[in-house]
């Protein structure tokens, strides 16, 4: 029988009974957090042969071997992994051996066997026979091999029963326990599995089979299982399911989901039956079982129980990540924060529709509303008192609503209200009226012309650039001297510049009132000579990089209650010149014959221009005399190098460190101090262990029900 989807056995060992009739676990198997040591000898699940995802064992007291529990577990498919691992054995205090003597294949993922203080028979298993790649295996902090004395069956009686393989240059017997060998198939089978009698299975079998060359006799399938047969691909009108079997449309349509949003059920996409459409796709209608590509970001409807969602911090904005339609009202009240504009854009930038009203008040940290970069419709289904669906009150630093040249925003119902926004020009508000279709809805007091924009230079003239010169890391620009009606009102200029790979930046990108700004700023004093045009040299730039640049005149903003004119330029895009590229990366060379070298490399990290060709130079080197110094047929003549064994937590020093053989010369020698690279590697290793342990704890600990 198929069990699943995923089985979690915790706290009570008697829950193991749930595995009684399982032949395949469709999903994962967790056995964990059983703190009372029990006698597991009466529990045996010989029917279980396949786990389609992963096996996780964590803190199960009293369990000494897995061999009695799962004598016939043959394949762990690793269709979904636990932090890149298909087999995790972690902090199993009493486990003495793994003992999964029928485990022949871990199809995907690596293994992690860590912090099992009593666990032996790890060096006797050749994982390369089970996994495709062993380089990602992590076997650390278990019982030191020296204390284990692992013996394979028959070695004591000098009648060894197990086969030998080479691991790390050690040719040795391979076994799971003191009485179970590791099964190996004849070399004639190649990658194929084999029966107990060493006959080769059908190519579509995986792990083992009950009869040779028969695709209906497989213990598990290499690709897919359908109607008792192992097949390379699912037949027409059937669909892949959970990475291992083929099901028909009716089966897929009748899967019930525990998700509370399950109104539509599973879908069929790209020949697979799956719970949801994959990223970038959406159902073709609410009751459809098929997916179509989304136009732009896929819609995600978010709803606020209390109707109004207050955004007063990055944390509250985080709840809206990925939302494209917000059912309810948005109240934005951002008084302070770090890097607030880009954080808000990250979490709210996909919102396209708000069904209720939008209210922005006391948001002194905001300079612009451009973080709502995809907002195109405010429905106004719910409105504030006075029938307002867009309400902007007392935002001391708000200067821009949106870039109206590139923005289409409709307010379907309700009015707008603006008051006490001293840096927001009334012209910006009037522009919003035009774009949103609300012109004529507002009454006279809804847009206050006295207290909006009274601390801004609102009527802007355009500054024109007169010349630009570039080198590989510099840009020189000049612009027309700006002449306001009274020259004393002009204080200086500010030049803003930043890297801009695309020509789509706006003045307020990444800018907030708390100091965060994605633009670099340089102040430029007025040239003393009235006939000289102001300009600047921008230096320390990157070669072959496009920059966006604009200039603003810094003017006195109030002259006896009249708004005076300011001035700024359009955004200019300018690219620095090309330069010499950095060196090519990861150069590797290998010989594939006596007269050829194959050289490979990766492009430079800083091309500093368009790369057109590479130059490869080579020269003959004299042969290294070291190669002739030893007779490599004589084992004794090879210099011995001793490597650390990499166990963690405990460093045992049992030998005199001064008696080591160093560099081929006998004599007393201290262990070399660790290099910076080694120290860094150890630090990264410790960090990696912590990250995994946090992931494990976060994944498996759930709060007790109230």
């Amino acid at each position: 029988e198929i069990c699943g989807p995923g089985i979690d056995i915790r706290n009570d060992y008697q829950q193991l009974k749930r595995l009684e009739n399982c032949t395949v676990i469709e999903g994962y198997l967790h056995i964990l957090l059983i703190s009372k040591a029990e006698d597991y000898r009466s529990y045996r699940f010989p029917k279980l042969t396949v786990i389609t995802e992963y096996l996780l064992l964590f803190r199960v007291a009293g369990l000494e071997s897995l061999g009695d529990l799962f004598p016939n577990l043959t394949v762990i498919r690793g269709w979904k992994l636990f932090y890149n691992y298909a087999l995790v054995i972690f902090e199993m205090t009493n486990l003495k051996d793994i003992g999964l003597y029928n485990l022949r294949n871990i199809t995907r993922g690596a293994i992690r066997i860590e912090k099992n203080a009593d666990l032996c028979y790890l060096s006797t298993v050749d994982w390369s026979l089970i996994l495709d790649a062993v380089s990602n295996n992590y076997i650390v902090g278990n019982k030191p091999p020296k204390e284990c004395g692992d013996l394979c069956p028959g070695t004591m009686e000098e009648k060894p029963m197990c086969e030998k393989t080479t691991i790390n240059n050690e040719y040795n017997y391979r076994c799971w326990t003191t009485n179970r060998c590791q099964k190996m198939c004849p070399s004639t089978c190649g990658k194929r599995a084999c029966t107990e009698n060493n006959e080769c299975c059908h190519p579509e079998c995986l792990g083992s089979c009950s009869a040779p060359d028969n695709d209906t006799a497989c213990v598990a399938c290499r690709h897919y299982y359908y109607a008792g047969v192992c097949v390379p691909a699912c037949p027409p009108n059937t669909y892949r399911f959970e990475g291992w079997r083929c099901v028909d449309r009716d089966f897929c349509a009748n899967i019930l989901s525990a998700e509370s949003s399950d109104s539509e059920g599973f879908v069929i996409h790209d020949g697979e039956c799956m719970q949801e459409c994959p990223s970038g796709f959406i159902r073709n209608g609410s009751q459809s079982m098929y997916c179509i590509p989304c136009e732009g970001p896929c819609p995600k409807v978010c709803e606020e129980e209390k109707k109004t969602k207050t955004i007063d911090s990055v944390t509250s904005a985080q709840m809206l990540q990925g939302c494209t339609i917000f059912k309810g009202n948005l109240l934005i009240n951002i008084r302070r924060g770090n890097n607030i504009a880009s954080e808000l854009e990250n979490f709210m930038g996909l919102i396209e529709v708000v069904t209720g009203y939008v209210k922005i008040r006391h948001s002194h940290a905001l300079v612009s509303l451009s973080f709502l970069k995809n907002l195109r419709l405010i429905l106004g289904e719910e409105q504030l008192e006075g029938n307002y669906s867009f309400y902007v009150l007392d935002n001391q630093n708000l200067q821009q609503l949106w870039d109206w040249d590139h923005r289409n925003l409709t307010i379907k119902a309700g009015k707008m209200y603006f008051a006490f926004n001293p840096k927001l020009c009334v012209s910006e508000i009037y522009r919003m009226e035009e774009v949103t279709g609300t012109k004529g809805r507002q009454s006279k007091g809804d847009i206050n012309t006295r207290n909006n924009g009274e601390r801004a230079s609102c009527e802007s003239d355009v500054l024109h650039f007169t010349s630009t010169t570039t080198s590989k890391n510099r840009i020189i620009i000049t612009w027309h001297r700006y002449r306001p009606p009274d020259y004393r009102d002009l204080i200086s200029f500010t030049v803003y510049y930043k890297e801009a790979p695309f020509k789509n930046v706006t003045e307020y990108d990444g800018q907030d009132a708390c100091g965060s700004n994605s633009w670099n700023m340089v102040d430029v004093d007025l040239p003393p000579n009235k006939d000289v045009e102001p300009g600047i040299l921008l230096h320390g730039l990157k070669p072959w990089t496009q920059y966006a640049v604009y200039v603003k005149a810094v003017t006195l903003t109030m002259v006896e209650n009249d708004h005076i004119r300011g001035a700024k330029s359009e955004i200019l895009y300018i690219r620095t010149n090309a330069s010499v590229p950095s060196i090519p990366l990861d150069v590797l060379s290998a010989s594939n014959s006596s007269s050829q070298l194959i050289v490979k490399w990766n492009p430079p990290s800083l091309p500093n221009g368009n790369l057109s060709y590479y130059i490869v130079r080579w020269q003959r080197q004299p042969q290294d005399g070291y190669l002739y110094r030893h007779n490599y047929c004589s084992k004794d003549k090879i210099p011995i190098r001793k490597y650390a064994d990499g166990t963690i937590d405990i460093e045992e020093v049992t030998e005199n460190p001064k008696t080591e053989v160093c560099g081929g010369e006998k004599g007393p020698c201290c262990a070399c101090p660790k290099t910076e690279a080694e120290k860094q590697a150890e630090k990264e290793e410790a960090e990696y262990r912590k990250v995994f342990e946090n992931f494990l704890h976060n994944s498996i600990f759930v709060p007790r029900p109230e």
Epitope: E1, C3, G6, V247, F251, S257, A258, D262, S263
Partner: nanobody, 123 residues
Framework: EVQLVESGGGLVQPGGSLRLSCAAS????????MAWFRQAPGKGLEFVSA????????RYADSVKGRFTISRDNSKNTLYLQMNSLRAEDTAVYYC????????????????WGQGTLVTVSS
Amino acid sequence: EVQLVESGGGLVQPGGSLRLSCAASGRTLSSFVMAWFRQAPGKGLEFVSAISGSGLRARYADSVKGRFTISRDNSKNTLYLQMNSLRAEDTAVYYCAANPRYATPDLTQYAYWGQGTLVTVSS
């Protein structure tokens, strides 16, 4: 862990109706697919009906289609089975079961089970 307790069983005449309930404790029921199974005297376990976590989708065995209705009240953590037009062959012990994530049509090994309630249809 999840504890399930069935109630509502009893003796009923052919053609009559009965409503079974299954109360859950230990976890919120809304995060499970819920199902009813039955076991007639001397027979194997038989699937009756199942319902999705939201309660919007359900599935029935052919033998009960049109007569039985499964429903759930997640706020009360309770599953129901309304049985109408009962027949003698509906006599069985009815079990309530719960499974996380999802339940395929061929799944009989649900994660959690109740103790069962006996329904007898006889004149």
